[in-house]
């Protein structure tokens, strides 16, 4: 048989348990709230530092581009991919269609004031969806020239001529002072490419790389 | 030996035509932009149209748009200017000049002695 | 349009000595190393010869004491030494985009 405590020893005994308790919770309670302060400052440093790289990134293009329009990459909430308002976007890409008439050189110029470079047209995709944006009546520069009027024709990127994936109308390019390119809409052809004097005052398409913040 | 030689000025009265011609030779004429700049008196030069090799392309300052029209002939050898409605501050020399293309742009390497067109009531 | 402002409007230069006529555009007629801005000699009574064209290509026959130089929107043509028959008007013209402008003109006298 267990010999009773005495009341003293109770009290004790009750007091040591008690304090046993009292000092895990404290200790309990320290390490959540360590965890917690941990797991809210990581994120919200991680997230502060982003948005100030964002901000930074932004300011970059205000000169030019006063807003821009974003739209969410992905699931991830924190990766965004801009273009100009006024703008369109395709695939990773922004393009603007240019409705001041002016030369070849001059709309590069004005392209690249805005960070971007007259049209590159790498597949039949890009071109289907930049015609919808263009007027039939109307004939566009494309990034494409052939200064030294050798039928040599280069893009404005460097991008590689390629023969194989070109849109000439039919007969086209047929003149060796015509050094420039645009894209126009033929009745029995639809949309093509054409080359023409660059001198000659067109509408042009401007296009650039989609900004990712 | 390239030649160029204009035809076809004279004295006019405001509101008349005269049509102006440029016979070339020694060159593939059908190869070229050609062009018409013209030359009041004592005054500097002044470009009045321009029309491209194949005929696909027509340009003309503001200060004759409408009133001039530029056009060729490449089986004969000819460039054309038409005037019509003439001003006596269209009274100049005019030249017929051939175009050479260089990179973007293009420089007039050929000259015609030019023809005096004198509009005056 | 672009504007071209020719200066001086006249100058008397003595044989062997330089001439120099600048041009000034109104906006850059440069575009990736080229530079579209030509000159002519005109004589009196004559139509206008071309001496240079892309700023700094002599035309074939002209004497290499015509030179010419610049970029973007100031241009040079210098003549060194001058010759007696070089008294004319001097006119730049740029092709960059029409319409196609010139210069007022420059008259070189020879003292």
């Known amino acids: 048989m267990v010999p009773e405590e005495e009341p003293q020893d109770r009290e004790k005994g009750l007091w040591w348990f008690q304090l046993k308790v009292w000092s895990m919770a404290v200790v309990s309670i320290l390490l959540l709230s360590v965890c917690f302060t941990v797991s809210s400052v990581v994120p919200h440093n991680f997230m502060y530092s982003k948005t100030v790289k964002r901000l930074s990134k932004l300011r970059e293009y205000q000169q030019y581009h006063p807003s821009l329009t974003c739209v969410m990459e992905g699931k991830d909430i924190e990766d965004w991919s801009c273009c100009p308002t006024p703008w369109t976007s395709f695939q990773s890409s922004c393009y603007f269609i240019s409705t001041g008439m002016q030369s070849w050189t001059k709309s590069q110029k004005n392209c690249s004031v805005m960070g971007a470079d007259l049209v590159v047209i790498n597949t039949r995709e890009e071109q289907d969806f930049i015609i919808q944006n263009l007027k039939r009546n109307s004939s566009y520069f494309l990034g494409l020239s052939d200064p030294g009027g050798r039928r040599h024709w280069q893009w404005v990127d460097q991008t590689p001529y390629n023969e194989n994936v070109t849109f000439w109308h039919s007969g086209e390019p047929n003149n060796l002072d015509e050094r420039c390119a645009i894209i126009n809409f033929r009745s029995s052809e639809e949309w093509g490419w054409n080359d023409i004097h660059c001198h000659v005052p067109q509408k042009s398409i401007c296009k650039m790389k989609k900004i990712y913040i | 030996e390239v030649q160029l030689v204009e035809s076809g000025g004279g004295l006019v009265k405001p509101g008349g035509s005269l049509r102006l011609s440029c016979a070339a030779s020694g060159f593939t004429f059908s190869s070229y932009g050609m062009s018409w700049v013209r030359q009041a008196p004592g005054k500097g030069l002044e470009w009045v149209a321009t029309?491209?090799?194949?005929?696909?392309?027509?340009y003309y300052p503001d200060s004759v748009k409408g009133r001039f029209t530029i056009s060729r002939d490449n089986a004969k050898n000819s460039l054309y200017l038409q005037m019509n409605s003439l001003r006596a501050e269209d009274t100049a020399v005019y030249y017929c000049a051939r175009q050479l293309y260089y990179s973007y742009g293009y420089y007039f390497d050929y000259w015609g002695q030019g023809t005096t067109v004198t509009v005056s009531s | 349009d672009i504007v071209l402002t020719q200066s001086p409007a006249s100058l008397a230069v003595s044989p062997g000595q330089r001439a120099t006529i600048t041009c000034r555009a109104s906006e850059s007629v440069s575009f990736h190393g080229t530079h579209l801005m030509h000159w002519y000699q005109q004589k009196p009574g004559q139509p206008p010869k071309l001496l240079i064209y892309?700023?700094?290509n002599l035309e074939s026959g002209v004497p290499a004491r015509f030179s010419g130089s610049g970029s973007g929107t100031d241009f040079t043509l210098t003549i060194n030494p001058v010759e007696a028959n070089d008294a004319a008007n001097y006119y730049c013209q740029q092709s960059i985009e029409d319409p196609p402008t010139f210069g007022g003109g420059t008259k070189v006298e020879i003292k």
């Open positions: 892309a700023a700094s």
């Open positions: 029309i491209s090799s194949g005929d696909s392309y027509t």
